[in-house]
């Protein structure tokens, strides 16, 4: 849905959430361009680009939450992701530097689309939370054990270490969105019930 407006149709809203998470788990939209821009596209370095366990809520944790709790956890985690992406963006080379070094400007544009896309997703999360609140059947909200603090980078000794940290973070983010997509795919056809 467009930013700031809410669809009142549950299945349209759920479809939009499913579509957004479907696209956000695609590494070609964020992780892959980051790896190329930062010069990490080397087999040996790629091995180090694995997420640190615990940086994001696991799929098991997400599945254990009620729908409202899941949305709260997702929203909080995405808030942390937005902070982290802002930090990563500040450390990226500028467009003219990329051109000079023969790197693809499209990769930078892809990275810069990530935050608007997350804002669009958060808008739909807000809309879905509203819609669930207005639906007939109340559901107890289990508190999410998700990331309420931004996943903190380990102290980086140098710029290279920070690049690797960014890489691990983005790897974890895509994995997290994959889990989110799997949870959304199990939501029922009505706002009042969920297939488990």
């Amino acid at each position: 849905a467009a930013i700031g407006s809410c669809s009142k149709e549950y299945r349209v809203l759920l479809g939009q959430l499913q579509k957004q998470t479907d696209l956000m788990q695609d590494t070609s939209r964020l992780l892959d361009p980051y790896i190329r821009i930062q010069g990490l596209d080397v087999p040996k370095l790629r091995e180090h680009c694995r997420e640190r366990p615990g940086a994001f809520p696991s799929e098991e944790t997400l599945r254990g939450l009620g729908r409202r709790g899941f949305l709260q956890t997702l929203n909080a985690t995405l808030g942390c992701v937005l902070h982290r992406l802002a930090d990563l963006e500040q450390r990226l080379p500028k467009a003219q530097d990329l051109e000079r070094s023969g790197l693809n400007i499209e990769d930078l544009e892809k990275l810069q689309m990530a935050r608007p896309n997350i804002l669009g997703l958060r808008n739909n999360i807000y809309c879905m939370a509203q819609l669930l609140d207005n639906s007939d059947t109340a559901e107890p909200t289990k508190a999410g054990r998700g990331a309420s603090q931004p996943p903190t980078p380990t102290p980086a000794s140098d710029a290279f270490q920070r690049k690797l940290e960014g890489c691990r973070f983005l790897h974890g983010y895509h994995r997290f969105m994959h889990s989110v997509g799997r949870v959304f795919s199990k939501w029922g056809e009505s706002p009042n019930r969920s297939r488990r």
Partner: antibody, heavy 120, light 106 residues
Framework: QVQLKQSGPGLVQPSQSLSITCTVS????????VHWVRQSPGKGLEWLGV???????DYNAAFMSRLSITKDNSRSQVFFKMNSLQADDTAIYYC??????????????WGTGTTVTVSS | QIVLTQSPTIMSASPGEKVTMTCSGS?????MYWYQEKPGSSPRLLIE???NLASGVPARFSGSGSGTSYSLTISRMEAEDAATYYC?????????FGSGTKLEIK
């Protein structure tokens, strides 16, 4: 490969109902939604409704009062029925497949189309 | 409901020429979808999620845009591209289509 074959009458009397069957192959109706879209010279392409994999339906509000979509998963058939047809319902009617098991409201494979003329 | 306005309504291009057509929404949408329809055939999905090529679609087709403004581009026109092209949105209920751009070969 994925196919949607349609069967139904070409001519319908005014005020009568239209029934079209969409028989699918290459995928299961328990995994994908099937939408209905019509195309007329005056109004272009119009989305009419959908039946989702679990059997829930959504209809365009403009047609809700006279539209019914049902299915038989075991026979791989979707049934479309529209009542009280008038001359401006003359169009090509298509069934079309949703691209995956999620609630996606666009169409990756379209049926063969049924040309319907409403006339006495 | 969201009204999608396509322009131009009709256009022609020579083989090898670059072609761009636009789709403008009455409100902002998240993603745009494009279909190609040839006479006597059913519509065919061309572009999904604004810029992703559907299966089997030649790389000369591309899509872009955001908000209320979207476009479909053919980098080098070929005779087989002569068809009518429709945009579609489903960010807002009900899903709606543009009225089409008819592309002819010169």
């Amino acid at each position: 490969q994925v196919q949607l074959k349609q069967s139904g009458p070409g001519l319908v009397q005014p005020s009568q109902s239209l029934s079209i069957t969409c028989t699918v192959s290459g995928f299961s109706l328990t995994n994908y939604g099937v939408h209905w879209v019509r195309q007329s010279p005056g109004k272009g392409l119009e989305w009419l409704g959908v039946i989702w994999r679990g059997g829930s339906t959504d209809y365009n509000a403009a047609f809700m009062s006279r539209l019914s979509i049902t299915k038989d998963n075991s026979r791989s058939q979707v049934f479309f029925k529209m009542n009280s047809l008038q001359a401006d319902d003359t169009a090509i009617y298509y069934c079309a497949k949703s691209p995956n098991s999620n609630f996606y409201w666009y169409f990756d494979v379209w049926g063969t189309g049924t040309t319907v003329t409403v006339s006495s | 409901q969201i009204v999608l306005t396509q322009s131009p309504t009709i256009m022609s291009a020579s083989p090898g020429e670059k072609v761009t057509m636009t789709c403008s929404g009455s409100s902002s949408v998240s993603y745009m979808y494009w279909y190609q329809e040839k006479p006597g055939s059913s519509p065919r999905l061309l572009i999904e999620d604004t810029s992703n090529l559907a299966s089997g679609v030649p790389a000369r087709f591309s899509g872009s845009g955001s908000g209320t403004s979207y476009s479909l581009t053919i980098s080098r026109m070929e005779a087989e591209d002569a068809a009518t092209y429709y945009c579609q949105q489903w960010s807002s209920y009900p899903p709606t289509f543009g009225s089409g751009t008819k592309l002819e070969i010169k």
